[in-house]
Interface confidence: low
């Protein structure tokens, strides 16, 4: 018994005065606690606890289940204990079959012995199977067998406590070890869509998928910069032992513009946290925004091709698209397609393919698009660049030489005089009058220019050249004339087209 200095409270004394007592099944257990301030006896084994306020604990016919720790406590809270083994050859183990172990921690297989004098107290695999090679354990007859550093691989391991009795191996009831995995990585979180665009009154629903090794992972939906608790629903599955999946679905049944914002799905475990966000934009009504991919004023050479391309945002989805020219709708030559196959895509592309454009095909080309809420349009002004064409070249009754040319951009007309039979006309002649004839008309067709010179200025035989040119090319017309005495011969015009 412990000895203490006089004056200090001392723990109670127990008779018999030993730490362990072995009795046979059916025998009497008689324990006496001596202390002036006796309070109670407490008996503990596995999860069972009994109390007795008598200072003498008597069990007339001991059973194996009376094996355990008997503790006497006094009013000072000081105590003394004796451990009693009730030896029963038919019941060598007391068992609590629940067996849970946390990965990397120790866990106790609770199979205390009723007889401390049996030998080879250990663990054995079920049905003759060997235990995992790396499984280490420490036996304690009063508590059970401690498995050291539980591994994930031990999950669902079936085992028995075992002792040798009279040369034979005796097994306890079987235990199935359930391993609770340790978190060795942050949860994996993903969201059904990264962004949502809705009209007022539509339902917003987004699902966050959380994956981890066990269901004890924590998860929640949060609104950024807000503490409001969001309503969410859960579904969960165990795909095998250490593969847990939870789906947390957040729903706003009738979204409003002020619900717009960033929503975060947050998950954490003892290792760390992870999050993923989704953006909600709620608009009061739908919209269409058109972005031309080329300049809306287009210059193209005669006979060449041009593609008119627009990108547009449409929400809700576009319902009608068309390209129009001169009040006529194109039935072909155009295509319309989503910019991406992403489910949340709102951006589209429309292309009109104009091929081998003629000078007469310039004008306004309009793209129109509509959805259930709005209409929108964009116009392209297409100018077809054409080489000048000399429409008329005449000597007028008043003696003027007149040249009329058409083309786009507006042609310039220069006049040249070639004396005698020279092929090259170099001396330029200033026109008397220059007019753009149809400048008040539509701006997309060819522009017509008229230029006149006074033929009376010419005193010698020769050729007069009218040359019309612009950025695209040039064309010439010629007037041949000769003097007979004092009179000019009839002037014979002819043209020479210069590429």
């Amino acid at each position: 018994q412990p000895s203490v200095s006089p004056g200090e409270p001392s723990p109670p004394s127990i008779h018999p005065g030993k730490s362990d007592l072995i009795v046979r099944v059916g025998d009497e257990i008689r324990l006496l606690c001596t202390d002036p301030g006796f309070v109670k006896w407490t008996f503990e084994i596995l999860d069972e606890t009994n109390e007795n306020k008598q200072n003498e604990w008597i069990t007339e016919k001991a059973e194996a289940t009376n094996t355990g720790k008997y503790t006497c406590t006094n009013k000072h809270g000081l105590s003394n204990s004796i451990y009693v083994f009730v030896r029963d050859p038919a019941k060598l183990f007391l068992v609590d079959r629940s067996l849970y172990g946390k990965e990397d921690n120790d866990t106790l297989v609770r199979c205390p012995l009723t007889d401390p004098e049996v030998t080879n107290y250990s663990l054995k695999g079920c049905q003759g199977k060997p235990l995992p090679k790396d499984l280490r354990f420490i036996p304690d007859p009063k508590a059970g067998i401690m498995i050291k550093s539980v591994k994930r691989a031990y999950h669902r391991l079936c085992l028995h406590c075992s002792v040798d009795q009279e040369g034979k191996s005796v097994l306890s009831e079987k235990f199935i070890l359930k391993v609770r995995p340790a978190f060795k990585a942050v949860p994996v979180v993903s969201v059904s869509k990264a962004s949502y665009l809705l009209r007022e009154g539509e339902e917003f629903t987004v699902t966050c998928t959380i994956k981890d090794v066990s269901s004890s992972v924590y998860s929640t939906w949060k609104r950024e910069n807000s503490q409001t608790k969001l309503q969410e629903k859960y579904n969960s599955w165990h795909h095998g032992d250490f593969n847990y999946e939870r789906q947390a679905t957040l729903t706003i049944s009738s979204a409003r513009v002020n619900d717009s914002g960033v929503f975060m799905c947050y998950a954490n475990n003892t290792f760390g946290s992870a999050n993923v966000t989704t953006t909600l934009e709620v608009v009061d009504k739908g919209f269409i925004n058109i972005f031309p991919m080329i300049n809306t004023t287009v210059f193209v050479n005669d006979g060449e091709n041009v593609d008119l391309i627009v990108e547009y945002e449409a929400f809700p989805k576009p319902e009608h698209q068309q390209w129009i020219y001169m009040n006529r709708t194109f039935t072909d030559k155009w295509e319309d397609y989503p910019k991406s196959e992403n489910e949340s895509n709102i951006r589209y592309v429309s292309e009109l393919h104009l091929t081998r454009l003629k000078g007469t095909e310039g004008g306004t080309y309009t793209f129109l698009v509509s959805n259930s809420d709005v209409n929108a349009a964009i116009a392209f002004n297409v100018y077809v660049n054409t080489k000048p064409e000399i429409l008329t070249y005449d000597r007028l009754v008043n003696g003027m030489l007149q040249c009329v040319a058409a083309g786009f951009p507006e042609p310039t007309i220069d006049w040249y005089f070639c004396p005698g039979t020279e092929q090259r006309c170099s001396a330029s002649v200033l026109p008397v009058d220059v007019q753009t004839l149809n400048s008040s008309g539509p701006p997309f067709g060819k522009l017509v220019v008229q230029s006149s010179i006074d033929s009376s200025a010419f005193k010698h035989n020769g050729t007069v050249e009218c040359k019309a040119y612009n950025d695209v090319g040039k064309t010439s017309a010629y007037f041949n004339f000769a003097f007979k005495g004092n009179n000019k011969e009839q002037i014979h015009p002819h043209t020479l087209f210069t590429p």
């Epitope: 049905q127 003759g128 669902r156 009831e173």
Partner: antibody, heavy 122, light 106 residues
């Protein structure tokens, strides 16, 4: 769901052979002892044979030891019973059963198949 | 070999009755006794193992008792679904079954 499903039995001639199989699902087949138990029409149950988890130990009813062979394929989750030199008294419903145990060497059969009927007759 | 005897081959009882079925072993089987239920369609189910331990999923109206060579199965409140044949089985030395007791409704 833990299930044991025996193969189709049938009618066989005396002195011929037959192999029964039992497909297990819903549990780790290789963790359990397995057994065959039979029932003669309108009679009681009779244990036929047992096999340990990896097939290294087998046990038979003495009177059947020379004619019946129990085996297993853990990769396929199948238990077999090869019966040879069949006699009319082997006519019975044959059940496949899973063995579990309590304590040291004390056995019980905790999951049973639905049984398959073997008729030995000329 | 250990022989198992169920002296009562058939038994009639009314719904709600307390029914006891007995089984005797030819030698001491150290409580290594199990009870099985076989329904009319041939389906076999474990009810009780190690004399008195109830298999999971079995209704608590079933109980077992006994020691040495004499054992019994009790159904405390007979229900329609309990109509079946009941077999005892020893697990002391290899495995052997009793002849069965067929339970019928009066």
């Amino acid at each position: 769901e833990v299930r044991l499903v025996e193969s189709e039995g049938g009618l066989v001639q005396p002195r011929s052979s037959m192999k029964l199989s039992c497909t297990a699902s819903g549990f780790t087949f290789s963790d359990y002892y397995m057994a065959w138990v039979r029932q003669v029409p309108e009679k009681g149950l009779e244990w036929v044979a047992n096999i340990n988890y990896d097939g290294s130990s087998t046990y038979y009813l003495d009177s059947l030891k020379s004619r019946f062979i129990i085996s297993r394929d853990n990769a396929k989750n199948i238990l077999y019973l090869q019966m040879s030199s069949l006699k009319s008294e082997d006519t019975a419903t044959y059940y496949c059963a899973r063995g579990d145990y309590y304590g040291t060497t004390y056995w019980y059969f905790d999951v049973w198949g639905t049984g398959t009927t073997v008729t030995v007759s000329s | 070999d250990i022989q198992m005897t169920q002296t009562t081959s058939s038994l009639s009882a009314s719904l709600g009755d307390r029914v006891t079925i007995s089984c005797r072993a030819s030698q001491d089987i150290s409580n290594y006794l199990n009870w099985y239920q076989q329904k009319p369609d041939g389906t076999v189910k474990l009810l009780i193992y190690y004399t008195s331990r109830l298999q999971s999923g079995v209704p608590s109206r079933f109980s077992g008792s006994g020691s040495g060579t004499d054992y019994s199965l009790t159904i405390s409140n007979l229900e329609q679904e309990d109509i079946a044949t009941y077999f005892c089985q020893q697990g002391k030395k290899l495995w052997s079954f009793g002849g069965g007791t067929k339970l019928e409704i009066k």
